[in-house]
Interface confidence: low
């Protein structure tokens, strides 16, 4: 646990905005203590759903009756700590993150249920819960040990629009192919019927008496 004196984080809440170098974090964690440390617990491991949603509980041992609490989620990767999101709430009220935040949450007593959305495999990492009891004094700060969030990317699903384009292209191709095939076969048939015709028709005497051509349909026996 570490205390940041009376510094209050007026962090901007846009996504992953601030990246602190490790040296700065080290400095912050070992500033002379002007405040009181508080125990924060969070699960060691959480698995994100296939839709990239991870939920975990951040629980703090509140030493007093705080009315204003600030919760910050930090992501630690390699030597850098990045702020993912933050929210300040009044005890008994809903936790409100910015509209464009990837985090949502609910509070219940000393528990904050945090949900991070839109996670991808590259977002796998250690997510640290930081809780600050802002009001009334004294100021308390607690930093959890972090929750390792594992994220797997689901098998990529082809875009439905893309599929429609493929379908249109294939059907168009097939249409033109059948059109071409029909045209070629028709021209071949015509060539076979009238070899070297000059385009002048001469009435010829019939070789057989003219009569109705008999059409013999196929006989399909029905049992």
């Amino acid at each position: 646990m570490a205390c940041l004196g009376f510094q209050r984080h007026k962090a901007q809440l846009n996504l992953a905005t601030r990246t602190w170098p490790c040296t700065l974090l080290f400095f912050l964690l070992f500033i002379p203590v002007f405040c009181k440390a508080m125990h924060v617990a969070q699960p060691a491991v959480v698995l994100a759903s296939s839709r990239g949603i991870a939920s975990f509980v951040c629980e703090y041992a509140s030493p007093g009756k705080a009315t204003e609490v600030r919760v910050t989620v930090l992501r630690q990767a390699d030597s850098q700590v990045t702020e993912v999101c933050a929210a300040t709430y009044m005890m008994g009220n809903e936790l409100t993150f910015l509209d464009d935040s990837i985090c949502t949450g609910t509070s219940s007593g000393n528990q904050v249920n945090l949900t991070i959305q839109g996670l991808r495999a590259m977002d796998t990492g250690l997510y640290i819960c930081k809780v600050e009891l802002m009001y009334p004094p004294p100021y308390y700060l607690g930093i959890g040990n972090g929750t390792q969030i594992y994220v797997i990317d689901p098998e990529p699903c082809p875009d439905s629009d893309f599929l429609l384009w493929i379908l249109a292209a294939v059907s168009s191709g097939l249409f033109f192919y059948s059109f071409l095939l029909t045209a070629v076969s028709l021209s071949k048939m015509l060539k076979k019927r009238s070899p070297l015709t000059t385009g002048v028709y001469v009435k010829m005497p019939p070789t057989e008496p003219e009569c109705e051509k008999q059409f013999q349909p196929y006989f399909i026996p029905i049992n």
């Epitope: 617990a41 969070q42 699960p43 060691a44 491991v45 698995l47 994100a48 759903s49 296939s50 509980v57 629980e59 040990n145 390792q148 594992y150 797997i152 689901p154």
Partner: antibody, heavy 124, light 112 residues
Framework: QVQLVQSGAEVKKPGASVKVSCKAS????????INWVRQAPGQGLEWMGW????????NYAQKLQGRVTMTTDTSTSTAYMELRSLRSDDTAVYYC?????????????????WGRGTLVTVSS | DIVMTQSPLSLPVTPGEPASISCRSS???????????LDWYLQKPGQSPQLLIY???NRASGVPDRFSGSGSGTDFTLKISRVEAEDVGVYYC?????????FGGGTKVEIK
């Protein structure tokens, strides 16, 4: 050094109780759960139950319900497993194993750290 | 309870050769989050079990890359690309989807 150190071997009579301890060191005890797994001589592994080192939530195997109690002492980072009304078929090596589930019952993931085991012999 | 069935019971291997162990569960271990809740453990003679593979195919830290896990749903396989003498012992699969957590009967790998 990250480890789970278990108490020594025990010999008990049928009907008696046994309490096995498992002391964690090298990691934050309350960030994990502790499972107990036993192995009868020459047999496979059998899961007995789980306890959250964070808040004491438990989940016991139905087969042992009523006979087993799992507890933790966060001040000493120690987990305990007590088995009552011992029978001869309770003779086994009892292992404690760390699990990343801390606060909720339900889905578990893996046991990444095991104790060396405690042999409990039940014999008249 | 979910029943875990392993095969073969015994597997004599030659060092340097590959080996494969199968594990089948009585119901699917695929969670809606996309993970298969199946782990593989190795218990070397006279030792505690040690984690090899978790969530179906993830190698635990410190486990040599000759070990790999595959499969989904109800059928899983542990493969050792080139068996080494230190790989002898009993291999167990375990389902971690629901309690009671259950183990397979074990596969004893020994050097020929």
């Amino acid at each position: 050094q990250v480890q789970l150190v278990q108490s020594g071997a025990e010999v008990k009579k049928p009907g008696a109780s046994v309490k096995v301890s498992c002391k964690a060191s090298g990691y934050t005890f309350t960030s994990y759960g502790i499972n107990w797994v036993r192995q009868a001589p020459g047999q496979g592994l059998e899961w007995m139950g789980w306890i959250s080192a964070y808040n004491g939530n438990t989940n016991y195997a139905q087969k042992l319900q009523g006979r087993v109690t799992m507890t933790t002492d966060t001040s000493t980072s120690t987990a305990y497993m007590e088995l009552r009304s011992l029978r001869s078929d309770d003779t086994a090596v009892y292992y404690c194993a760390r699990d990343p589930v801390t606060m909720v019952r339900g889905v578990h993931w893996y046991f990444d750290l095991w104790g060396r085991g405690t042999l409990v012999t039940v014999s008249s | 309870d979910i029943v875990m069935t392993q095969s073969p019971l015994s597997l004599p291997v030659t060092p340097g050769e590959p080996a494969s162990i199968s594990c089948r569960s009585s119901q699917s271990l695929l969670h809606s989050n996309g993970y298969n809740y199946l782990d593989w453990y190795l218990q070397k003679p006279g030792q505690s079990p040690q984690l090899l593979i978790y969530l179906g195919s993830n190698r635990a830290s410190g486990v040599p890359d000759r070990f790999s896990g595959s499969g989904s749903g109800t059928d899983f396989t542990l493969k050792i690309s080139r068996v080494e003498a230190e790989d002898v012992g009993v291999y167990y699969c375990m389902q971690a989807l629901q309690t009671p957590l259950t183990f397979g009967g074990g596969t004893k790998v020994e050097i020929k």
